[in-house]
Interface confidence: medium
């Protein structure tokens, strides 16, 4: 049984009756194939469900799909397959849902082999109605909405053409041929790579990076010898082949590719890769793969320009390009990230940073847990978190770690307690302070989700047997109650709740199996009557984030400021509500050397917080250069950590040194950049 499932727990009274009145079953009139679910808009209650069923015949595969729509968060569904003329929808393209609350949906249909182009069904009224449109091309990718204007769509064709629509897919225009990768930037800008000779694969490393800011009327070549590119926050990254060998190097632009600087990162060879782990408008976490098939690399964190990088974490687990990494942004507390390292003995250990990659430590051992067999010392060990890598290795881990920005401080994850990740069956752990302290929440693996901004946590046991019980907690996982939502157990396939954790509805998906047939079924439970009143001021308490030492005046200071939050008391059983806004009070901290990183040409000796000038850069180090605008080439040795808001206190001043002599770059010069028009 779960910790806290005892008589002393604070019980919610009469919850069985309250939940029974708010449990809605829907049996789908299909054979069991695959099912996909999408939420349309925010707080609209509209859900689209696409079920598909394949019958492999001797000559071809016959497919059938059905489309259902709910407008009450999944309590009732209506079959709307006739709105798409009973057409078979291609599941690999999914349902392309428009940004924000645009109400737009695009479904891509399966068409017969000889047709001139593909077919889509478009809705701009939250899937109440659909319009069929035949395309002048066969799509290779899902339609991509411009983040700024949901009427603007782009798609790549199977012939590598870049197609754009300005009227939500009604009319399409091919704006460029020979395109490998295309992405929307800001302000309706499109970035894409093109090949000149054979193909995307053959020209890898010889691609050109282009930009159009007017949906294809005019173009600008902003990079050559490109291997690939990526966008993160306000940064545009390109990996560029070196002139003299097969290595490549990251270049970065903060002005949409007009000017570039070489990132102070190691170059990589053909078998290695770069990966943007996380990026925002302040900085970027970059993984650089180690040479050889090691399965690990190094995490670097950038300055505010994306140019100067500090080594953040060695031996960072990342299996292969596009492979698995456990790197997780803990969205419930600023500055917190969790990931895994591959230690010298090939065991995998979890590390956490509370200051955006400045320092990494092991996770504190939960007080209510014993060290497992992986621990050398039974009294000293750490919590290790299962994430993407464990899931890819088919360990008994049904879900990755979970955190939500509006459920402040809460992190839920599968884990084991020892010296390294264990392959034994994991338990579920919870932190209520953003990862500083942990408690075992549930015994064994579970599916879990957060509702009502943390007011309710729901969990279902991960089992190969049919299930009919759901667990819920109203006190951040301390005490659990169980509710039998159906007499007839179902084979469970997934928990679904509206993204954003503001909803009070949870849908349990699964299928029933009888001797003759197998059918999809969903149960939607509304917890509104459990949380029967709205939260008031007295239900909240003040919490200082990142607090480790109350005696220290700088307690809670991370990246130059501290934040006090109003948090729901664990014993308060009430609704935060859909409109709940996290209340926080920031206060600025005094600057210390910890608030600065070392600028280009400077480094921190181990166990020293001062930045000292590197000896004259020689050989390989010459490639760690700044390129572009003149001001990049002057430094006072320190640079404020991106996002750091400290004021006063230590203000390191250095004589400005001209580092021009230390700088070379081989990337495209601005004067070589040419504009073209259609």
């Amino acid at each position: 049984s779960a910790p806290g499932e005892d008589e002393e727990c604070g019980r919610v009274r009469d919850f069985v009756a309250k939940l029974a009145n708010n449990t809605h079953q829907h049996v789908f009139d299909d054979l069991r194939g695959s099912v996909s679910l999408s939420w349309v808009g925010d707080s609209t209650g509209v859900i689209l469900v696409l079920t598909t069923f394949h019958v492999p015949l001797v000559i071809m595969t016959f497919g059938q799909s059905k489309l259902y729509r709910s407008e009450d968060y999944g309590k009732n569904f209506k079959d709307i397959t006739d709105l798409i003329n009973n057409t078979f929808i291609r599941t690999e393209f999914g349902m392309a849902i428009g940004p924000e609350n645009s109400g737009k949906v695009v479904l891509t249909a399966e068409v017969s082999g000889g047709s001139r182009g593909g077919r889509i069904f478009r809705s701009s009224d939250f899937a109440k109605n659909f319009v069929q449109t035949d395309l002048p091309f066969h799509p290779l990718t899902q339609m991509m909405y411009s983040p700024q204007n949901s009427d603007y769509l782009l798609a790549l064709s199977t012939e590598n053409g870049l197609w754009v629509s300005k009227n939500f897919g009604g009319k399409w225009e091919e704006i460029h041929k020979a395109v490998c990768l295309a992405k929307w930037g800001s302000d309706n800008t499109i970035f894409f790579t093109t090949y000149a000779n054979g193909s995307c694969k053959a020209d890898l490393g010889a691609l050109e990076l282009w930009r159009t800011s007017d949906l294809g009327k005019s173009f600008k070549t902003i990079g050559v010898k490109i291997y690939s590119f990526g966008l993160g926050g306000r940064f545009l990254f390109a990996s560029v082949m070196a002139d003299k060998d097969t290595t490549r190097r990251i270049h970065v632009s903060t002005d949409q590719g007009d000017t570039w600087s070489m990132a102070q990162l190691p170059s990589v060879g053909q078998e290695q890769f770069y990966s943007i782990l996380a990026a925002n408008d302040d900085m970027v976490f970059m993984h650089v793969d180690e040479p050889g098939d090691t399965g690990f690399g190094t995490i670097f964190t950038s300055d505010d320009r994306g140019i100067v990088y500090s080594k953040s974490l060695d031996r960072h687990l990342y299996t292969t390009t596009g492979g698995e990494t456990d790197f997780t942004n803990v969205t419930s507390l600023r500055g917190v990230y969790i990931t895994s390292v591959l230690s010298e003995d090939n065991s995998i250990q979890t590390m956490i940073t509370f200051d955006q990659g400045g320092r990494w430590t092991h996770l504190r051992k939960p007080e209510n847990s014993e060290c497992d067999a992986t621990a050398k010392n039974k009294n000293e060990c750490s919590l290790h978190i299962h994430a993407s890598y464990s899931i890819s290795q088919k360990l008994n881990v049904p879900m990755a770690p979970l955190s939500e920005p509006n459920a402040v401080g809460i992190v839920i994850a599968h884990g084991s307690v020892g010296d390294a990740i264990s392959v034994m069956v994991p338990d579920v752990y919870i932190s209520d302070d953003g990862g500083y302290s942990w408690t075992k929440m549930l015994e064994g693996p579970h599916y879990y989700t957060i509702l009502d901004s943390g007011g309710i946590i729901v969990a279902i046991e991960h089992s190969s047997r049919p299930i009919n019980v759901i667990k819920f907690s109203t006190d951040e996982g301390q005490c659990w109650q169980t509710y039998t939502f159906t007499r007839d157990p179902i084979y469970f396939t997934g928990l679904a709740s509206e993204p954003g954790a503001r909803s009070m509805n949870i849908s349990i998906w699964g299928f029933t199996e009888s001797a003759l047939t197998s059918q999809w079924v969903s149960y939607t439970i509304d917890f509104k009557d459990i949380l029967e009143r709205n939260c008031e001021e007295k239900d909240y308490t003040i919490w200082l984030a990142h607090s480790t030492d109350p005696e220290d005046y700088e307690d809670g200071c991370i990246l130059g400021y501290k934040e006090q939050f109003l948090r729901l008391r664990k014993s308060s059983v009430c609704q935060n509500g859909r409109d709940y806004v996290v209340t926080k009070q920031p206060s600025i901290c005094l600057c210390s050397l910890e608030d600065f990183l070392c600028d280009f040409g400077y480094y921190r000796p181990e166990n020293d917080s001062k930045c000292v000038e590197q000896p004259e850069l020689k050989g390989h180090d010459l490639e760690f250069c700044l390129y572009g605008r003149e001001e990049h080439l002057t430094t006072n040795g320190y640079r404020k950590i991106p996002g750091d808001k400290c004021q006063g206190g230590v203000n390191p001043v250095r004589e400005v040194k001209d580092l021009k002599k230390k700088c070379t770059s081989n990337f495209l010069s601005p004067e070589k950049q040419n504009s073209k028009s259609n």
Epitope: G10, Y436, Q478, K538, S547, Q564
Partner: antibody, heavy 124, light 107 residues
């Protein structure tokens, strides 16, 4: 060492006001809530409210709402509790007490340091 | 407001006795329950916080347990300096409330 030193005993007439001070030393004053608790002769303990010295935010027990004002002066690490419209049943020992903190939570962990108490007598 | 009910209101015991005081909350307060000791003419002293955590400097003969609504303070072997009044206090929901107290006297 950590201590709270309160002002001396007061004798007041009904309808008057009293202001009790509590000077903190030996710790970072703004990092801990300050609670005020009173105890009538021969009775139990009664919580009046708290002040967050960092922000000046307060929370008062409903019973004292409108009559109590809690303030602080961070420059001299002192908290104040003023009770107005005094009645005879306000005769009590008034304590200031520091709220214990744990991993960021300001409430929920009791009061770990107490002042020596200030006796307030309300009599006509 | 949450009512805190302490029992017994007084008890007589001898040095070396094991003493148990209970405290019941009118609704769940999770583990936000604290215990204090008060001697005549003195300010209260925090013994146990968060239901079971021993405040530093407090002898280990004092222990606390419970969560939700029912809590217990135990003195494993009563010492002469332990004769005092003991109060429980919930600090989970405003207003903070105290129990009525339990007076431990010498038998």
């Amino acid at each position: 060492q950590v201590q709270l030193v309160q002002s001396g005993a007061e004798v007041k007439k009904p309808g008057a006001s009293v202001k009790v001070s509590c000077k903190a030393s030996g710790y970072t004053f703004v990092a801990y809530y300050m609670h005020w608790v009173r105890q009538a002769p021969g009775q139990g303990l009664e919580w009046m409210g708290w002040i967050n010295p960092n922000s000046g935010a307060t929370r008062y027990a409903q019973k004292f709402q409108g009559r109590v004002t809690m303030t602080r002066d961070t420059s001299i690490s002192t908290a104040y509790m003023e009770l107005s419209r005094l009645r005879s049943d306000d005769t009590a020992v008034y304590y200031c007490a520091r709220g214990k903190r744990s991993s960021g939570w300001y409430e929920g962990y009791g009061m770990d340091v107490w002042g020596q108490g200030t006796t307030v007598t309300v009599s006509s | 407001d949450i009512q805190m009910t302490q029992s017994p209101s007084s008890l007589s015991a001898s040095v070396g006795d094991r003493v148990t005081i209970t405290c019941r909350a009118s609704q769940s307060i999770s583990s936000y329950l604290n215990w204090y000791q008060q001697k005549p003419g003195k300010a209260p002293k925090l013994l146990i916080y968060a239901a079971s955590s021993l405040q530093s400097g407090v002898p280990s003969r004092f222990s606390g347990s419970g969560s939700g609504t029912d809590f217990t303070l135990t003195i494993s072997s009563l010492q002469p300096e332990d004769f005092a009044t003991y109060y429980c206090q919930q600090s989970d929901v405003s207003p903070i409330t105290f129990g009525g107290g339990t007076k431990v006297e010498i038998k």
